[in-house]
């Protein structure tokens, strides 16, 4: 007989859950790569762009060996929540130019939300604490100019791409350790 009614479903195979999270992450990575390319094509980037409000990259080649599942999932979820807020901000505040990419940005935001829900589910199934961000989210201010918001878009998509790229590698590595 299955678990009693009302009790949380405990996954019989965390690896399968992790697989599903990896698939979603990979899919989002492909979407982000495509949208970043569209952005570069439509609004050529003059060099690399940074945005102080974006999270710093959590993983690198040097840290891959010491990754722990709880830490990776928690940090990934916090970082992706930040990127979700930034994409939402871009859609609402960045001006008419970016409205030409509205369907793609909307789809990206929806996929990001789906991945965040999947990570939350994975963490609850693995009985990991649902850690809140260290500090409350800083409100994102208005872009100083249309040009500034395009630079911000390049930074957001570039940062999200890097984060997802490392996330796929990290999650795949952790799967082998389960």
């Amino acid at each position: 007989p299955g678990p009693p009614a009302g009790s949380p479903r405990v996954s019989s195979d965390p690896r399968a859950d992790l697989d599903s999270a990896v698939l979603l992450t990979r899919s989002l990575l492909a979407d982000t790569r495509q949208l970043a390319a569209q952005m570069r094509d439509k609004f050529p980037a003059d060099g690399d762009h940074n945005l102080d409000s974006l999270p710093t990259l959590a993983m690198s080649a040097g840290t891959l060996g010491s990754l722990q599942l709880p830490g990776v999932l928690t940090r990934l979820r916090v970082d992706l929540m930040s990127y979700f807020r930034h994409v939402q901000w871009l859609r609402r505040a960045a001006g008419p130019s970016l409205k030409t990419l509205e369907p793609e940005l909307g789809a990206l935001q929806a996929r990001l939300e789906r991945l965040l829900r999947r990570l939350q589910l994975l963490m609850s199934r693995l009985a990991l604490p649902q850690a809140a961000p260290d500090q409350p989210a800083v409100p994102l201010g208005p872009p100083a100019s249309a040009w500034g918001s395009i630079r911000a878009a390049h930074a957001i998509l570039g940062g999200l791409h890097l984060t997802l790229d490392w996330a796929v590698r990290g999650l795949l590595l952790l799967k082998t350790r389960l």
């Epitope: 439509k42 008419p96 130019s97 409205k99 100019s145 040009w147 395009i150």
Partner: antibody
Framework: QVQLVESGGGVVQPGRSLRLSCAAS????????MHWVRQAPGKGLEWVAV????????FYADSVKGRFTISRDNSKNTLYLQMNSLRAEDTAVYYC??????????WGQGTLVTVSS | QSVLTQPPSASGTPGQRVTISCSGS????????VNWYQQLPGTAPKLLIY???LRPSGVPDRFSGSKSGTSASLAISGLRSEDEADYYC???????????FGGGTKLTVLG
């Protein structure tokens, strides 16, 4: 300080054309999307068109689509509105406005266009 | 017929608090930021509130904006005679791919 000065308004007959200009100063013109907004005598504000900071994206109100063309020359810090096939209902004060996002933070003083036979 | 709906007029006496409403839909107010403009007689409009509730520098804190769902409102407290003007709300509309305005509210300061 930021300044936007419109010119080119005047009296014109229905069906004729007119070109408005907006000279910008006091800021990096090429960094900002620019809009035209109009106001018929005694009426409310009506958005007309917007052009992106580098000039590649343009959006128009349905009421002017196909008749009006917004353009800009970033080397001259100037915004334009080419108005063709003018109608009596286009009679209004035309304002150019600067926008960092979707809000107009600076407006010109306006130029009056009167379409009358 | 404006896409955003505002009351045509509002009034109050000096020192009072007045609220002006602005009603829209999911494609404008519901999914984009709301801005408010003040137009004094014979002058160009001036930005009063942007990003739903932010005030540009130089705008007194007597003016405040708020938004809930597909409606927004502008509140003016400690009403003064110089506040007598037309007030307009605006937002980007995703369906129309353009900026939409309310019809404007003429504020009269009595007495």
């Amino acid at each position: 300080q930021v300044q936007l000065v419109e010119s080119g308004g005047g009296v014109v007959q229905p069906g004729r054309s007119l070109r408005l200009s907006c000279a910008a100063s006091g800021f990096t013109f090429s960094h900002y999307d620019m809009h035209w907004v109009r106001q018929a005598p005694g009426k409310g504000l009506e958005w007309v068109a917007v052009i992106s900071y580098e000039g590649s994206n343009k959006f128009y109100a349905d009421s002017v689509k196909g008749r009006f063309t917004i353009s800009r020359d970033n080397s001259k810090n100037t915004l334009y509105l080419q108005m063709n096939s003018l109608r009596a209902e286009d009679t209004a004060v035309y304002y150019c406005a600067r926008t960092p996002g979707f809000h107009f933070d600076y407006w010109g003083q306006g130029t009056l266009v009167t379409v009358s036979s | 017929q404006s896409v955003l709906t505002q009351p045509p007029s509002a009034s109050g006496t000096p020192g009072q608090r007045v609220t002006i409403s602005c009603s829209g839909s999911s494609s404008n107010i519901g999914s984009n930021y709301v801005n408010w403009y003040q137009q004094l007689p014979g002058t160009a409009p001036k930005l009063l509130i942007y990003y739903d509730d932010l005030r540009p520098s130089g705008v007194p804190d007597r003016f405040s904006g708020s938004k809930s769902g597909t409606s927004a409102s502008l509140a003016i407290s400690g009403l003064r005679s110089e506040d007598e003007a037309d007030y307009y709300c605006s937002a980007w509309d995703d369906s129309l791919s353009g900026v939409v305005f309310g019809g404007g509210t003429k504020l009269t300061v009595l007495g």
